[in-house]
Interface confidence: low
């Protein structure tokens, strides 16, 4: 995955000038009304704003920006279409517009900045490649089963946080928390076997940029499918069974009977 480029002078022409408001637009400055933080949708004529909330975090950064796309580009992709559309309609197109880019740091003035840095999160649901949804089967267990209609409300909404970890072109480290609950998927040894569990954490301290390794999964995208590899136990993946209503678990095999491929659906905040 490419390093974020130095800010070119032509890009700087569209920079707001306020170091707390790092936003750019394809067509030059306009009034910004919306935020990229939670993947909320902007008006069709709007841009996308990335807000750095504290001056500290500009310390030690290489001067950088991700590519930001005006919604005009999205409109061209979707023409012809109604003037208003739902976020779910857009989620299909996000992968074509936005690429998750790691931000590389030269140095940190203080290790604490890593812990305290704002964490980018998005809300989503996951379905396995058989279209089974993930639901709570009890306080600390997830199970996978086919849901229809109103029962879809039972599926777990994850808060996927983009955290610090070993990154490469095809691996993005994430933590998978349950939305509005202080539970995170974690990988631990139980009876000498890597095991997936839901772990309670102190909500005051999570999510954080530097998550403990047991909470970190490498999100791997292959052919529009996602895999979630344990950072703690390489080559062990979040898995589901072919059978209905069975626990979600950590599996050590890919391409076998167990399912390790998932699709992600964006959920509005």
């Amino acid at each position: 995955m490419a390093e974020v480029p130095e800010l070119a002078s032509e890009m700087m022409a569209y920079y707001s000038g306020n170091e707390d408001d790092l936003f750019f637009e394809a067509d030059g400055p306009k009034q910004m009304k919306c935020s990229f933080q939670d993947l909320d949708l902007c008006p069709l004529d709007g841009g996308i704003q990335l807000r750095i909330s504290d001056h500290h975090y500009s310390k030690g950064f290489r001067q950088a920006a991700s590519v930001v796309v005006a919604m005009d580009k999205l409109r061209k992709m979707l023409v012809p279409c109604p003037q208003t559309f739902q976020e779910n309609d857009l989620s299909t197109f996000f992968p074509f517009i936005f690429e998750e880019e790691p931000i590389f740091f030269d140095t940190w003035d203080n290790e604490a900045y890593v812990h305290d840095a704002p964490v980018r999160s998005l809300n989503c649901t996951l379905r396995d490649s058989q279209q089974k949804s993930l639901v709570m089967s009890g306080p600390y267990e997830l199970k996978a089963l086919h849901l229809q209609g109103q029962d879809m409300e039972q599926q777990v909404v994850f808060s996927m946080s983009f955290v610090q970890g070993e990154e490469s072109n095809d691996k993005i480290p994430v933590a998978l928390g349950l939305k509005e609950k202080n539970l995170y998927l974690s990988c631990v040894l139980k009876d000498d076997k890597p095991t997936l569990q839901l772990e309670s954490v102190d909500p005051k301290n999570y999510p954080k940029k530097k998550m403990e390794k047991r909470f970190v999964f490498n999100k791997i995208e292959i052919n529009n499918k996602l895999e979630f590899e344990s950072a703690q136990f390489p080559n062990w993946y979040i898995s589901t069974s072919q059978a209905e209503n069975m626990p979600v678990f950590l599996g050590g095999t890919k391409g076998g009977q167990d399912i390790t491929d998932f699709t992600m659906q964006f959920v509005s905040s």
Epitope: V135, M136, S137, G138, P139, Y140, L145, Q154, E180, K181, N182, S200, D202, P203, N245
Partner: antibody, heavy 118, light 107 residues
Framework: EVQLVQSGAEVKKPGESLKISCKGS????????IGWVRQMPGKGLEWMGI????????RYSPSFQGQVTISADKSISTAYLQWSSLKASDTAMYYC???????????WGQGTMVTVSS | EIVLTQSPATLSLSPGERATLSCRAS??????LAWYQQKPGQAPRLLIY???NRATGIPARFSGSGSGTDFTLTISSLEPEDFAVYYC?????????FGQGTKLEIK
């Protein structure tokens, strides 16, 4: 209508065994945990244990571990609470309740009164 | 093991008044807290789940708040049918303890 219907009141002697039931209807019985709650006369609610009927995964409160057995027969959508040897102190109202994905018991049975007296 | 302590044990109020019931956990339970109402001779009824969400069919005069260790059930304007015993309940590590209850009685 989603409901849990419990078996009727029981009067037993100390040392006897007993199995009371809780039958679910109006929803997918195997997809929700069923909990058992005790209420002694004039007292508050005490959680005893919980079972997932689909695979009979069962968890007990330490206070009741070894004192009672919780089971389920998913083919007839029924959960059970049983004692192998009753004591006078087991006299209480026993409720079953469905545990939702939202961390609460949302549907309750009407209760089964168990009286143990010599 | 987490212990839930409810206060007061008994609350004497008149219809139309505002009732505030407290539930304190011995350690943080995040938002995993529910409130139940029980009337004499009846099974408990779920009022509030996840600390602040009203269960289906529960009147708007009932509201819940709090997180961590301190939680509150508020009844904005008491109706005659609201006089009952109220229990809080949470879950942590496969434990589902209830508080000892608050009896709300007519003054």
């Amino acid at each position: 209508e989603v409901q849990l219907v419990q078996s009727g009141a029981e009067v037993k002697k100390p040392g006897e065994s007993l199995k009371i039931s809780c039958k679910g209807s109006g929803y997918s019985f195997t997809s929700y945990w069923i909990g058992w709650v005790r209420q002694m006369p004039g007292k508050g609610l005490e959680w005893m244990g919980i079972i997932y009927p689909s695979d009979s995964d069962t968890r007990y409160s330490p206070s009741f571990q070894g004192q009672v057995t919780i089971s389920a027969d998913k083919s007839i959508s029924t959960a059970y609470l049983q004692w192998s040897s009753l004591k006078a102190s087991d006299t209480a109202m026993y409720y079953c309740a469905r545990y939702t994905n939202w961390d609460a018991f949302d549907i309750w049975g009407q209760g089964t009164m168990v009286t143990v007296s010599s | 093991e987490i212990v839930l302590t409810q206060s007061p044990a008994t609350l004497s109020l008149s219809p139309g008044e505002r009732a505030t019931l407290s539930c304190r956990a011995s350690q943080s339970v995040s938002s995993y807290l529910a409130w139940y109402q029980q009337k004499p001779g009846q099974a408990p009824r779920l009022l509030i789940y996840d600390a602040s969400n009203r269960a289906t069919g529960i009147p708007a005069r009932f509201s819940g708040s709090g997180s961590g260790t301190d939680f509150t059930l508020t009844i904005s304007s008491l109706e005659p049918e609201d006089f009952a015993v109220y229990y809080c309940q949470q879950r942590s590590n496969w434990m589902f303890p209830f508080g000892q209850g608050t009896k709300l009685e007519i003054k």
